[in-house]
């Protein structure tokens, strides 16, 4: 808290300009009118104020707007945004994408801070859903943004927004998130032809069910091993050796290098050894000849 002291004669600020950097904290408090500051916020960013001076400016705005800053002020906060707490930001009503971009720019190159997370949360809740433009903006600043959302939050993403998603945006998504995103992607890309469709859907396949993988195996897609390794274990297990061979195409040889890893390891154990031998890769651990192959889906449902 800065003590209330009278402004010295001749020091009353008529403009927000560089002369203010020579003011002591108490002089800033006494001589800068909060309403003036609010109308000339765009100038603050160009002036090399100290952190202590910025604290005073923030204090003045807090007094002027105890219920939260108006968007006209928020849009021009610049580096003063870094002084805001999540509690401050929860009072705001940010509706303009331009405002959001301006504030994200301030934090660019840094991890997502609690302030930024709160700002994004307020913005998205205000809009009601993650529209394409918002998603475009957020993933441009934070490629991992999509994967930071809960499955429940992802359910509000409209299929049209999926066009904004790049493969790297999904790098840290877990299976539950991909379970939500995959059906949206499938819907978004449904009118594309085979090879183009596969290019777009590939990053989302960690949420694909068995029947979709079976369908893809009939389309000569040549899925790479990195994608195959990210598929849901329960979706891979029912695939036959022939289906996996068709799905992977020339990449099928890579199964040997992955035989100790999931989901390949689990899949191998479910196949007849005779069938595995047809691949000519030396994969071992399949069900020996003469063994009854159980209806595993039924077994697992029962157990």
């Amino acid at each position: 808290e800065v003590e209330k002291t009278a402004c010295p004669s001749g020091k009353k600020a008529r403009e927000i300009d560089e002369s203010l950097i020579f003011y002591k904290k108490w002089e800033l408090e006494a001589c800068v009118d909060a309403a003036l500051l609010a109308t000339q916020m765009d100038r603050v960013n160009a002036i090399p104020f100290t952190y202590e001076q910025l604290d005073v400016l923030k204090h003045k705005l807090d007094e002027l707007y105890p219920q939260g800053y108006p968007e006209s002020v928020i849009q021009h906060l610049g580096y003063l945004f870094l002084k805001m707490s999540p509690e401050d930001i929860r009072k705001w009503n940010v509706t303009s994408l331009e405002t959001l971009k301006a504030l994200l720019e301030v934090n660019k190159g840094h991890e997502m801070s609690p302030q930024v997370a709160t700002l994004i949360d307020r913005f998205v809740k205000g809009r009601g859903q993650l529209d394409k433009d918002t998603l475009d903006t957020l993933t441009a600043f934070y490629p991992g943004y999509l994967c930071s959302l809960s499955p429940e939050e992802l359910s509000s993403v409209p299929p049209s927004s999926i066009w904004a998603v790049r493969p790297q945006d999904l790098d840290t998504c877990d299976p539950r998130q991909l379970d939500v995103l995959y059906p949206k992607a499938r819907l978004a890309f449904q009118n594309m032809n085979g090879s183009e469709y596969f290019v777009k859907i590939q990053s989302f396949l960690g949420g694909a069910p068995t029947e979709d993988l079976k369908a893809l195996s009939q389309q000569n897609v040549s899925m790479d091993l990195a994608t195959f390794m990210k598929l849901r274990t329960d979706a891979v297990l029912p695939l036959t050796v022939a289906e996996v061979q068709k799905l992977l195409g020339p990449h099928v040889e890579g199964l040997k290098a992955e035989e100790r890893h999931r989901p390949v390891r689990d899949w191998i154990l479910r196949q007849r050894q005779d069938d595995l031998d047809t691949l000519g890769l030396g994969l071992q651990g399949g069900i020996p000849n003469g063994y009854l192959v159980l209806d595993l889906s039924m077994q697992e449902a029962l157990s």
Partner: antibody, heavy 120, light 107 residues
Framework: QVQLQESGPGLVKPSQTLSLTCTVS??????????WSWIRQPPGKGLEWIGY???????YYNPSLKSRVTISVDTSKNQFSLKLSSVTAADTAVYYC????????????WGQGTMVTVSS | DIQMTQSPSSLSASVGDRVTITCRAS??????LNWYQQKPGKAPKLLIY???SLQSGVPSRFSGSGSGTDFTLTISSLQPEDFATYYC?????????FGGGTKVEIK
Amino acid sequence: QVQLQESGPGLVKPSQTLSLTCTVSGGSISSGGYYWSWIRQPPGKGLEWIGYIYYSGSTYYNPSLKSRVTISVDTSKNQFSLKLSSVTAADTAVYYCARESTGTGAFDIWGQGTMVTVSS
Amino acid sequence: DIQMTQSPSSLSASVGDRVTITCRASQSISSYLNWYQQKPGKAPKLLIYAASSLQSGVPSRFSGSGSGTDFTLTISSLQPEDFATYYCQQSYSTPLTFGGGTKVEIK
């Protein structure tokens, strides 16, 4: 409710073979959705996976123990077994059998464990 | 083999505290990461599977997050029955491996 129960001698002499059996009750070991594992824990230390077996008889062993380990399954008795040869004092541990779900990759059911001491 | 490194190895906390335990894999394991709780003289008990899914019957104060190499177990409000040792375990690749454990003690 599936339950696992380890059985076998609590004392084994050095250089001999440790033999333990795990009996599965409340469900079939032939259910294809699970791997049947052995895990051990030396006194005051962490957990070490020994290996597992699938109902078909396929096995995976920890390479650090592979030369000494055999895991087998008897589906008719609903049991699977562990044999660890040429034991030393370093093999003294609580031995657990556990069920691993192929879907989740997690050990969702464990036996209560049996303490095996290697000493002459 | 994939090494699993847990930290801290032990911690002291009070009832009601928020507790976070981390687990790091020596290479990417996707989401094939499980968490267990073990009390003295008892077998481990599964808490979280597939990095973030809560095992049936486990209280909702336990949660897991992470993907790739870095994972976290969080207990939102520590209860008297939560004082135990916690282990992470990767199930991506054989040999299956566990973290060294984190002992949660009463402060």
